[in-house]
C-alpha cells in the first residue's frame, strides 16, 4: 500500500491503490548536496548522475572505519524519495548529487559553497531546464552561505533546505535561515511536529512550510534492493524538492516566487498541534504542510499571497523590526504585533526602490514584529497614500484617490507612547470601500493599487469587549491581502494574516471588566484579480 | 588577460614602499567585519572565507588573494589559497592564522571575513 | 551510444566453468549495475542476478547462488559473470544487460554445455 | 515454471489491438511500479518496450502501450503491424530481485 507520507502529499484526486501523479517533474533536474550516494541501487539507477564534485572534510577520530553502506546512507535514502522508482516524490525527476558531507555526515560551509558555484557554473556552461537544489543540511547561522543561496536563488534556481532537528529557531541556522531558500521542517504521520531523540524539528518565522519527515521510507544503501526508514527534516525538504519538481515541470516558467506561494497555497493548513511549539514561536511558525497541486495547470488565475514576519525588533525605545516581501512580490499591507501591546504601529516606507514594512516599538515594551503581506500581482502599481493624525476630528481617514487604484491595506503608526490613554470616539466612523479609518492621533498609511482586473472589499468582525481573538476572513475565491485591527486601543496586540483570515489579538480584559469603548474589529481587505482569471480561462 | 606575474611583481613593490607593510584601507571608508558562527563546537578556526565587494572581477580576487599571502609573508605567516571563488560570490577560502585576520580586513575589495564553520546532515 | 558488448560464444564440458565478459561503454557507468539474464533454447528469461559498477556489491538469484561470481573492471570497464560446475541444464545464450531495468541488452554469448 | 503467468501466445490481423497479461502477487507486479515489458524477434536479444508499468522509451512506437490493475499488467498494441510478431515478456521487481513471466508469442495474422 502507499506509504503514509506519499498518501499525505498527494490530493485525495490521484490516491488509488499507488502513488502515480501525472508528471514526474521529468523536465526538472534537482541537485542534492550531500554524502555519497549508492547510485546503481534499484530504486533511483539511472535517475542520478554523480558528479565529480567533491569536498568534505576528514571524518573524526582516528579509529574511524569508512564503511561504504554507511557513508552512502544519508544521500542514497535522499535521492529515493525525491524520485526513487516506488517510494518517491518526483518519480520522472533526474538528480545530480555532489558530495559535500563526508561519511559522518558533516560538511563545511565553505565545501558547501564551493559546490553552490559549482551548480551555478554548470548551469552557465549548459543551461537547462528548471533547477531544484536541495541542501538537506544545517550550520549555525553563517551570512556567506546565505549570501552564496541569495545570488544562486536570483539566478533562477529554486533551493530547498532543511530547517533543522535542533527543536530550536531556524532563524540561528544556515542556510535555514536565508530568506530565498524554501526551508522546510518535518511532521509526523499524525501532523504532529517532529521529535528526534531529545531534539527535533526546527520552527519559527524562517520555516516556509513543513513536509512529512518521520519514518520515512526510503532507498538503503545497505543493498542495492534494501529500503529503510529515516526521520529528519532533511526527508521533508527532500518531500518538497519533489513536489517543486513536478510543480516546475507542469509550469517551468514559474518563479521562484510563484512557486512558493503555490507550496503554500496548496498545503494543508492548520492541522499542525501548535503545542509542540514554544509558545513565543507559535505565532510566528507556519501552521502548513506540504502537498501536490489538485492539478498541475489552472492555479494562474488565483491572486496568491503570504505573510512574512520580520526578526523581533529588541525591547529599545526607539527599535524598529522590518519585514520585507520578496524581489518578484508586492507589499500589499502591513501591520504589527507585540506580546506586551506596547507598540507604535507600524507603516510601509520605500526602501531601495521597494516598499517595506516597519514596526516601531514604544517605550516599556518588550519589541514589535513587523508583518508584510506579499502577494503576486503581476503588472501591479501600488503606492502609499498617508494621512497625519487628525487630532481634533473623529479620527484620521485617509483613502485610494486614484483613478482605477483599489485599497490593499491599511496601517497606523503613532508616536504617542500609549494610544489607551487617549480614547477614541465612541462612535467611530465604519470603514468604506477604499479608504482606512484610524485613531485620531495616529497617521494612517492607506496601500493603494492599480493592477488589470483587480477589485477588494472590505470586510469587518467587531466583539463588544476583548477576549484574546477576533478573526474574518475572505470568502472563496477572494484573498486577504490587509489585516488590521479598529480603532487600535491598548487592548490590542497586533494584527496578522494567517492564510486567508484576519487575526486581531487583544489582552483578554475579561476578568477586569470592560467597556464599549475596548471593542474590538478586525478588518479584511480581501481582493480578487479578474483579469488572471480570464487569462487562465483563455489558456483552458 | 592581464600578466598576473607582473601583477603580482608590481605588487611586492608597492607592499615594499608601505612603512609597515599594512594594506591600504578599504576604499569608502567602510570596516569590513568578521564574522563566526555562534555555536563554539562548529566553528573551524584557522579556515576564513573572505568575501569581497560585489562588482570585484576574478583577477581582483586573485590579485587580493595573493596580496595577503604577500603581507602575511612579511610577518612570517603561512597562508594557503584554497579556493578563488566566482560566479556566486567574488572572494576566496583562505587556510591561515587567525592572527592575520585585522590585516585582511583592512584588504582592498573586501566586504567581510567569515570564519570556516560544520554544516551537518539533517 | 550506449552498448553492451559480450565475449564470444564457449563450448564446455560437465563440470567446467564459463567466463563470460561484457564490455560497457557511452554512459555513466556508476549510475546502473549490470543485470545478468540467460535464455535456455526454445524457453523463457531467467534473471540470474546482479552486480554494482559503483561499489562492486552483488545480489544473486537464490537459483544460480553459490555458483555464480559476477565481477567487475573498472579500469576497463567490463563485468564479467562466471558459472561453475557446469551442467547440461546451462546450455542457453547468457545476455548481460544495463540495470535493473534492462533498457539496453548485450548481444548474447552462447554457452553449450555437452560432454 | 515462472512468477509471471502471460498467455502461451495471441494473434491479431494487422490493424487490430491485442492486449497481453501478464499476473503476479502483491510481492512483484502488485507491490511495485516497475513492470517492464519486451520484445524479442528469433536470434535477437529482448528489447525494451515498455518500463515503469506504462512509459515509452524514446524511439518505441506510440502504438505500445502499458498500464498495471492490482496484480495484473498489460501490454495493448494497437493497430498491428507484421513487424511486431515476436515473442512478449513481461518482468517485475521483487523484495529482492527480479522475475519474468514465461513469455507470450504473437502471430500477426
Known amino acids: 500500500s502507499i506509504p503514509w507520507n506519499l498518501e499525505r502529499i498527494t490530493p485525495p484526486r490521484y490516491r488509488a491503490d499507488e502513488y502515480q501523479p501525472p508528471d514526474g517533474g521529468s523536465l526538472v533536474e534537482v541537485y542534492l548536496l550531500d554524502t555519497s550516494i549508492q547510485s546503481d541501487h534499484r530504486e533511483i539507477e539511472g535517475r542520478v548522475m554523480v558528479t565529480d564534485f567533491e569536498n568534505v572534510p576528514e571524518e573524526d577520530g582516528t579509529r574511524f572505519h569508512r564503511q561504504a553502506s554507511k557513508c552512502d546512507s544519508h544521500g542514497t535514502h535522499l535521492a529515493g524519495v525525491v524520485s526513487g522508482r516506488d517510494a518517491g516524490v518526483a518519480k520522472g525527476a533526474s538528480m545530480r548529487s555532489l558530495r559535500v558531507l563526508n561519511c559522518q555526515g558533516k560538511g563545511t560551509v565553505s565545501g558547501t559553497l564551493i559546490g553552490l558555484e559549482f551548480i551555478r557554473k554548470s548551469q552557465l556552461v549548459q543551461p537547462v531546464g528548471p533547477l531544484v537544489v536541495l541542501l538537506p543540511l544545517a550550520g549555525g547561522y553563517s551570512r556567506v552561505l546565505n549570501a552564496a543561496c541569495q545570488r544562486l536563488a536570483r539566478a533562477g534556481v529554486v533551493l530547498v533546505t532543511a530547517a533543522g532537528n535542533f527543536r530550536d529557531d531556524a532563524c540561528l541556522y544556515s542556510p535555514a535561515s536565508a530568506p530565498e531558500v524554501i526551508t522546510v521542517g518535518a511532521t509526523n504521520a499524525q501532523d504532529q511536529p517532529v521529535t528526534l531523540g531529545t531534539l527535533g524539528t526546527n520552527f519559527g518565522r524562517c520555516v516556509d512550510l513543513f513536509a512529512p519527515g518521520e519514518d520515512i521510507i526510503g532507498a538503503s544503501s545497505d543493498c542495492s534492493t534494501c529500503f529503510v526508514s529515516q526521520s529528519g527534516t532533511s526527508q521533508a525538504a527532500a518531500h518538497v524538492a519533489g513536489i517543486a519538481a513536478m510543480m516546475l515541470s507542469a509550469e517551468p516558467e514559474l518563479t521562484l516566487a510563484e512557486l512558493r506561494q503555490r507550496l503554500i497555497h496548496f498545503s494543508a493548513k492548520d492541522v499542525i498541534n501548535e503545542a509542540w511549539f514554544p509558545e513565543d514561536q507559535r505565532v510566528l511558525t507556519p501552521n502548513l504542510v506540504a502537498a501536490l497541486p489538485p492539478s498541475t495547470h489552472g492555479a494562474g488565475w488565483q491572486l496568491f499571497c503570504r505573510t512574512v514576519w520580520s526578526a523581533h525588533s529588541g525591547p529599545t525605545r526607539m527599535a524598529t523590526a522590518i519585514a520585507r516581501c520578496a524581489p518578484d512580490e508586492e507589499l500589499l499591507s502591513c501591520s504589527s504585533f507585540s506580546r506586551s501591546g506596547k507598540r507604535r504601529g507600524e507603516r510601509m516606507e520605500a526602501q531601495g526602490g521597494k516598499l517595506v514594512c516597519r514596526a516601531h516599538n514604544a517605550f516599556g515594551g518588550e519589541g514589535v514584529y513587523a508583518i508584510a503581506r506579499c502577494c503576486l500581482l503581476p503588472q501591479a502599481n501600488c503606492s502609499v497614500h498617508t494621512a497625519p493624525p487628525a487630532e481634533a476630528s473623529m479620527g484620521t481617514r485617509v483613502h485610494c484617490h486614484q483613478q482605477g487604484h483599489v485599497l490593499t491595506g491599511c496601517s497606523s503608526h503613532w508616536e504617542v507612547e500609549d494610544l489607551g490613554t487617549h480614547k477614541p470616539p465612541v462612535l467611530r466612523p465604519r470603514g468604506q470601500p477604499n479608504q482606512c479609518v484610524g485613531h485620531r492621533e495616529a497617521s494612517i498609511h492607506a496601500s493603494c493599487c492599480h493592477a488589470p482586473g483587480l477589485e477588494c472589499k472590505v470586510k469587518e468582525h467587531g466583539i463588544p469587549a476583548p477576549q484574546g481573538q477576533v478573526t474574518v476572513a475572505c470568502e472563496e475565491g477572494w484573498t486577504l491581502t490587509g489585516c488590521s485591527a479598529l480603532p487600535g486601543t491598548s487592548h490590542v496586540l497586533g494584527a496578522y494574516a494567517v492564510d486567508n483570515t484576519c487575526v486581531v489579538r487583544s489582552r483578554d480584559v475579561s476578568t477586569t471588566g470592560s467597556t464599549s469603548e475596548e471593542a474590538v474589529t478586525a478588518v479584511a481587505i480581501c481582493c480578487r484579480s479578474r483579469h488572471l482569471a480570464q487569462a487562465s480561462q483563455e489558456l483552458q | 588577460q592581464e600578466d598576473e606575474d607582473g601583477d603580482y611583481e608590481e605588487l611586492v613593490l608597492a607592499l615594499r614602499s608601505e612603512e609597515d607593510g599594512l594594506a591600504e584601507a578599504p576604499e569608502h571608508g567602510t570596516t569590513a567585519t568578521f564574522h563566526r558562527c555562534a555555536k563554539d563546537p562548529w566553528r573551524l578556526p584557522g579556515t576564513y572565507v573572505v568575501v569581497l565587494k560585489e562588482e570585484t572581477h576574478l583577477s581582483q580576487s586573485e590579485r587580493t588573494a595573493r596580496r595577503l599571502q604577500a603581507q602575511a609573508a612579511r610577518r612570517g605567516y603561512l597562508t594557503k589559497i584554497l579556493h578563488v571563488f566566482h560566479g556566486l560570490l567574488p572572494g576566496f577560502l583562505v587556510k591561515m592564522s587567525g592572527d592575520l585576520l585585522e590585516l585582511a580586513l583592512k584588504l582592498p575589495h573586501v566586504d567581510y571575513i567569515e570564519e570556516d564553520s560544520s554544516v551537518f546532515a539533517q | 551510444q550506449v552498448q553492451l558488448v559480450q565475449s564470444g560464444a564457449e563450448v564446455k564440458k560437465p563440470g567446467a566453468s564459463v567466463k563470460v565478459s561484457c564490455k560497457a561503454s557511452g554512459y555513466a557507468l556508476t549510475s546502473y549495475g549490470i543485470s545478468w539474464v540467460r535464455q535456455a533454447p526454445g524457453q523463457g528469461l531467467e534473471w540470474m542476478g546482479w552486480?554494482?559498477?559503483?561499489?562492486?556489491?552483488?545480489n544473486y538469484a537464490q537459483k544460480v547462488q553459490g555458483r555464480v561470481t559476477m565481477t567487475t573492471d573498472t579500469s576497463t570497464s567490463t563485468v564479467y559473470m562466471e558459472l561453475r560446475s557446469l551442467r547440461s541444464d546451462d546450455t542457453a545464450v547468457y545476455y548481460c544487460?544495463?540495470?535493473?531495468?534492462?533498457?539496453?541488452w548485450g548481444q548474447g554469448t552462447t554457452v553449450t554445455v555437452s560432454s | 515454471q515462472s512468477a509471471l503467468t502471460q498467455p502461451a501466445s495471441v494473434s491479431g490481423s494487422p490493424g487490430q489491438s491485442i492486449t497481453i497479461s501478464c499476473t503476479g502477487t502483491?510481492?512483484?507486479?502488485?507491490?511495485?511500479?516497475?513492470v517492464s515489458w519486451y520484445q524479442q524477434h528469433p536470434g535477437k536479444p529482448p528489447k525494451l518496450m515498455i518500463y515503469e508499468v506504462s512509459n515509452r522509451p524514446s524511439g518505441i512506437s506510440n502504438r505500445f502501450s502499458g498500464s498495471k490493475s492490482g496484480n495484473t499488467a498489460s501490454l495493448t498494441i494497437s493497430g498491428l503491424q507484421a513487424e511486431d510478431e515476436a515473442d512478449y515478456f513481461c518482468s517485475s521487481y521483487t523484495s529482492t530481485s527480479m522475475v519474468f513471466g514465461g513469455g507470450t508469442k504473437l502471430t500477426v495474422l
Open positions: 544487460a544495463r540495470g535493473y531495468g534492462m533498457d539496453v
Open positions: 502483491n510481492s512483484d507486479v502488485g507491490g511495485y511500479n516497475s
Open positions: 552486480i554494482s559498477a559503483y561499489n562492486g556489491n552483488t
